[in-house]
């Protein structure tokens, strides 16, 4: 995949939604100049490929959702990059405005004559991307058109500011209440010294920024924060695990708001080192619960604490998915690349026969092998259905008593339509309610994952807990077995009696020598010897001071 | 600082345990290893515990030593000694809590198998 | 691994000289190189760390330099008490300890 020619999945309608998925891995550094992709990707991109073909399937079969409107798509391949998104928007905005310049599909020529050539229905929206540095980019493009756009997992803080991203909504919650919920975490296990690291990028910065900010007012001193982008090269991670080790043994926390490629490489650098088990990362829910951050390195990742949007499986997705073929399934035009690179083999005779592979796929090949969904898969579907739901309520407003687009609603306003959009509210994939707040975001409910050792060479992530608008509920005993395997992660430990802490020039509140008051002196404060006046004694438990008893000495009494 | 102690003279294969014995810091704060000079040769690692108890080995010394730690003292136990384990046996303290560049370091003791 | 590779084996050089030590390692190894100087009866010493951090008390006629896989070890003003042998070593991967220090180079002066 480069620039030069970029492959678009169509399903035509009545009214055209775009949508941006993460087809393939983002660029390396050393192709992104020339915006070359990396390898297919099955959750992030063909699941949910399939996801959007498939709901708006479904959405055209129910009659009473758009009665006599059709609803089709024109799906493009964001690579998980800026540049790439954008130059696909741009497309998404070309067809837009050749639609807006034409009448009744004429297209007038430049030497004024007309042409019966019939261009592309404008994009009246657009589902994703998945990143939220990406999502940013199109979102400065989509809004200078009025173009509503919905997310699905782009979580940035910065997109709840409707001065800036107008046109942006989302049916995940901002990262704000993911950071408090990886403080509330920290703060429960006494954590009080932790490393930081995030992906260069909105997502993780603005998160980072979230956790520390919460984190200096609950008392909790970060070691160190690293910054490393997800496609950074074997040394940048190397040199990055050596600077959290200089830590250890006391910021052994490691607080990672990453992309999962990026604690990946985290994972890997600490097979390369000889690290396993020196750290505990807790991470955000860049990580969340997927196979394809910790495959091949579950010994690294053991313990890992990780955030999760909740979100259970859709079970008709998988009804749907698992059936597919690359003999049958056309409409989809990543779908033979992916399932060659699924199944490392060759797909002989076929129009994307990709030679690299030796061995011929055979017939008894199914996706039922090792399949798991996209943890996002249902947030992919309620963003799909909030654009149904939003145009669905802007015809029954626009157009009453008529069963499809009727002229009042053409061409589709995106001004009304986001109005529209706001005001959605419906039941979701999985029975939860979809709502939007004034900055288009949804509510804020998470599943806490633990990264475990199930059995002999058997790792599985497991629900140890939830965090549901500011309430954290935890499963300690599933989470350490036993208080004493409680991880310890501070800088120094609490002073005995008697003594007072010691911060030296330029060191974080949470690292102290322990400093004992002299003999006539008791603790003031943490910080603070102060001497008893004179007549006056420490009391035994040295916190202020006693009046000596006065001894009259007389004639008889022995010497003291 | 940090000195060995159990060097001696043995024949092969008898089991012999190297002591490591540590002041002025704590092992639960930073990692201990194990180097060894084969007269006539250079340096080469053994291996290394870190703060947290984990342990590292040379592919070559992997099953032939032990590494084990209390709270002052760094044990190598060299489980069936060959007359190529004939050396000077090093215990030293790394910079940091995991592997790292190592200073300082003990006198060392020396081992000699010979039958 | 990450092999170290040490040259010249022996290298002699007249007092005042100066004295260039390389060592290569099979992989990029990030800068975390350490040098030890080692004399007959004595443990090693550390030098440098991080390719070019003097460690206390070293003298600052020790030098280190490089990145990546190519490293060198310059001692300038050469003094009798230079006489030893010296080895460079990866401090970067605790689990490929194998061939982690550099064969040694003995220094001569003159």
């Known amino acids: 995949q480069s620039s030069e020619r970029r492959v678009v999945a169509h399903m035509p309608g009545d009214i055209i939604i775009g949508a941006l998925f993460s087809v393939h891995h983002q660029p390396t550094v050393d192709k992104v100049h020339e915006r070359k992709c990396g390898a297919v990707r099955e959750q992030y991109g063909i699941q949910r490929v399939e996801a959007m073909l498939h709901t708006l399937e479904r959405i055209n079969s129910d009659p009473t959702l758009l009665p006599n409107i059709t609803l089709g798509c024109e799906i493009r391949d964001s690579c998980w990059h800026s540049a790439v998104a954008l130059e696909q928007s741009i497309e998404f905005i070309r067809d837009s405005l050749i639609s807006s310049e034409e009448e009744e599909g004429l297209v007038r020529c430049v030497d004024g004559s007309s042409s019966s050539f019939r261009s592309k229905k404008p994009i009246v929206g657009v589902i994703g991307p998945g990143s939220s540095s990406v999502a940013i980019q199109v979102q400065n493009l989509l809004q200078l058109f009025n173009i509503p756009q919905i997310a699905y997992s782009a979580t940035s803080m910065d997109l709840s500011d409707k001065t800036l991203f107008k046109y942006f909504m989302r049916v995940v919650p901002s990262d704000a209440q993911q950071a408090r919920a990886m403080v509330d975490i920290v703060k429960r296990y006494n954590w009080t010294y932790v490393s930081a690291v995030h992906t260069e990028g909105n997502y993780g910065e603005s998160g980072m920024e979230a956790f520390k900010d919460m984190s200096a007012k609950e008392g909790i001193c970060i070691a160190h924060s690293y910054k490393i982008y997800s496609n950074a090269g074997e040394q940048s991670f190397d040199k990055l695990l050596k600077k959290l080790t200089s830590h250890l043994p006391k910021a052994r926390v490691v607080a990672c708001f990453c992309e999962g490629m990026t604690v990946r490489g985290l994972l890997m650098a600490m097979r390369r080192l000889g690290l396993a088990g020196e750290f505990l990362l807790l991470g955000s829910d860049g990580w969340a619960d997927r196979y394809d951050v910790t495959d091949g390195y579950q010994r690294e990742a053991v313990g890992g604490i990780t955030i999760k949007l909740q979100s259970p499986d859709v079970k008709w997705f998988d009804d749907y998915y698992l059936k597919l073929r690359p003999e049958t399934n056309h409409r989809n035009p990543w779908f033979q690349e992916f399932w060659q690179h699924r199944f490392q083999c060759r797909l002989e005779g076929f129009p994307q026969e990709n030679s690299k592979y030796n061995k011929t796929c055979n017939s008894s090949l199914t996706l039922k092998t090792h399949h798991v969904q996209d943890s996002k898969m249902g947030f992919v579907i309620n963003a799909i259905y909030s654009m149904a739901y939003g145009l669905h309520n802007m015809q029954m407003s626009l157009c009453p008593g008529y069963a499809g687009l009727c002229d009042a609603m053409k061409p589709i306003d995106g001004r009304k339509l986001l109005e529209s959009l706001m005001k959605t509210n419906f039941t979701g994939v999985s029975g939860d309610t979809i709502l939007f707040d004034e900055n288009g975001d949804s509510p804020g409910r998470y599943e806490i994952m633990n990264f475990k050792e199930m059995g002999k060479d058997y790792f599985d992530y497991i629900n140890v807990g939830s965090w549901d608008n500011g309430e954290l509920k935890m499963d300690d005993d599933e989470v350490w077995s036993k208080k004493s395997n409680i991880i310890r992660s501070v800088c120094s430990e609490p002073c005995e009696k008697g003594q007072i802490k010691v911060i030296r020039k330029g060191e974080v509140s949470c690292c102290w020598t322990c400093t004992p008051c002299k003999e006539n002196e008791y603790v003031f404060d943490e910080y603070t010897c102060k001497a008893c006046q004179l007549g006056s004694w420490p009391t035994d438990d040295l916190t202020g001071c006693d009046l000596i008893p006065v001894q009259y000495l007389r004639w008889g009494d022995p010497e003291p | 600082s940090v000195e060995e102690s159990g060097g001696r003279l043995v024949t092969p294969g008898t089991p012999l345990t190297l002591t490591c014995t540590v002041s002025?810091?704590?092992?639960?704060?930073?990692?201990m290893g194990w180097v060894r000079h084969v007269p006539g040769k250079g340096l080469e690692w053994i291996g290394i515990?870190?703060?947290?108890?984990s342990t590292y080995y040379a592919s070559w010394a992997k099953g032939r030593f032990t590494i084990s730690k209390t709270s002052t003292t760094v044990d190598l136990k060299i489980t069936s000694p060959t007359t190529e384990d004939t050396a000077t046996y090093f215990c030293?303290?790394?910079?940091?809590?995991?592997?790292?560049?190592?200073?300082?370091w003990g006198p060392g003791t020396l081992v000699t198998v010979s039958s | 691994a990450y092999d170290m590779t040490q040259t010249p084996a022996s290298v002699s050089e007249p007092v005042g000289g100066t004295v260039t030590i390389k060592c290569q390692a099979s992989?990029?190894?990030?800068?975390?190189l350490s040098w030890y100087q080692q004399k007959p009866g004595q443990p090693p010493k550390l030098l440098i760390y991080?390719?070019?951090t003097l460690a206390s008390g070293v003298s600052s006629r020790f030098k280190g330099s490089g990145s990546g896989t190519e490293y060198t070890l310059t001692i300038s003003d050469l003094e009798c008490d230079d006489a030893a042998a010296y080895y460079c070593?990866?401090?970067?991967?605790?689990?490929?300890?194998?061939?982690?220090f550099g064969g040694g180079t003995e220094v001569v002066v003159k």
């Open positions: 515990i870190y703060a947290s108890g």
């Open positions: 992989q990029s190894i990030s800068s975390y």
């Open positions: 991080e390719a070019s």
């Open positions: 070593q990866q401090d970067l991967s605790g689990s490929n300890l194998d061939n982690s």
């Open positions: 002025g810091f704590s092992l639960s704060r930073y990692a």
């Open positions: 030293a303290r790394s910079r940091t809590a995991t592997y790292d560049a190592v200073d300082p």
